[in-house]
Interface confidence: low
């Protein structure tokens, strides 16, 4: 079954290459187990950035080497992507799956355009 997912249209990454945004889903039921995946779309290519499965009320656990961190609160997931550079500018899509209990629900957001601007190098001091 389809599920509505909302996320901001545009986010500007910080000068340290960190971007945060909220992914909110309209849960049709009382899910206990949720999977959140961040997809990046650029030049018509879609790649998985990171994914986490979590139990409602618990923290999201991404893989140790993931560039993502996150927290959950009700039907909202606060996602943070780190280590971004200008070349990582693109559309970041939030995909939410209600894993348990059945029925399975899938929702895909319209995407958040993340703009990353590499900081200007500091000029050499005399």
């Amino acid at each position: 079954k389809a599920m509505h997912v909302a996320q901001p249209a545009v986010v500007l990454a910080s000068s340290r290459g960190i971007a945060s945004f909220v992914c909110e889903y309209a849960s049709p039921g009382k899910a206990t187990e949720v999977r959140v995946t961040v997809l990046r779309q650029a030049d018509s290519q879609v790649t998985e950035v990171c994914a986490a499965t979590y139990m409602m009320g618990n923290e999201l656990t991404f893989l140790d080497d993931s560039i993502c961190t996150g927290t959950s609160s009700g039907n909202q997931v606060n996602l943070t992507i780190q280590g971004l550079r200008a070349m990582d500018t693109g559309l970041y899509i939030c995909k939410v799956e209600l894993m348990y209990p059945p029925p399975y629900y899938l929702g895909i957001g319209n995407g958040t355009q993340i703009y990353v601007i590499d900081p200007e190098p500091c000029p050499d001091s005399d």
Partner: antibody
């Protein structure tokens, strides 16, 4: 290498119970993003989903079998169990356990199956 | 439960033939469909997942397509080892259900 090995099949009397085991190796049954299902196949018939256990330990059974089936696991032994009660002749089948990943839900690894015959 | 109907139930074909098997779902299952091959006395083997993704190690002559309610498994050039029974399976909603199977026999 991922492997699933079922055991516990054999001849069971009608009205009796069966307890099958599925020993997993090459991955942990409690690993995030992985679930395991039980599937059966009656002689000369198609495949039927019996139930599943999620990495969290949550279980799900089809309504038609819910009153008779229990799936559990022992994390220390990395083993999955299927208990089926009030057996009848139509429960005669080869029983398989199979693993899937939440990313695709395709059953990518299967056990060899164990035959259960319900007969007096 | 979601019903999956495969057609044909059986077919006869020769080595080198192009074979197409269809699977129709009783409701929209997006792309949550897998295809399996089963040989007598053996466990099923995953061929295709997510309707069109080829499982690692599966020959490229196997391909899947479709979304929503209509899906197709195609074997572009049938090989001797491809004579088997093929099943579709949906994972969109529990309980996950299988099609009734399509037996591919030698003509």
């Amino acid at each position: 290498e991922v492997q699933l090995v079922e055991s516990g099949g054999g001849l069971v009397q009608p009205g009796g119970s069966l307890r099958l085991s599925c020993a997993a190796s090459g991955f942990s049954l409690s690993t995030g993003g992985v679930g395991v299902g039980w599937i059966r196949q009656a002689p000369g018939k198609g495949l039927e989903w019996i139930g599943e256990i999620y990495h969290s330990g949550s279980t799900y059974y089809p309504p038609s079998l819910k009153s008779r089936v229990t799936i559990s696991r022992d994390n220390s032994k990395n083993t999955l169990y299927l208990q089926l009660n009030s057996l009848r002749a139509e429960d005669t089948a080869v029983y398989y356990c199979a693993r899937y990943e939440y990313s695709s839900y395709g059953l990518d690894y299967w056990g060899q199956g164990t035959l259960v015959t319900v007969s007096s | 439960d979601i019903q999956l109907t495969q057609s044909p139930s059986s077919l006869s074909a020769s080595v080198g033939d192009r074979v197409t098997i269809t699977c129709r779902a009783s409701q929209d299952i997006r792309k949550f469909l897998a295809w399996y091959q089963q040989k007598p006395g053996k466990a099923p083997k995953l061929l295709i997942y997510d309707a069109s993704s080829l499982e690692s190690g599966v020959p490229s002559r196997f391909s899947g397509s479709g979304s929503g309610t209509d899906f197709t498994l195609t074997i572009s050039s049938l090989q001797p080892e491809d004579f088997a029974t093929y099943y579709c399976q949906q994972s969109y909603r529990s309980p996950r259900t299988f099609g009734q199977g399509t037996k591919v026999e030698i003509k």
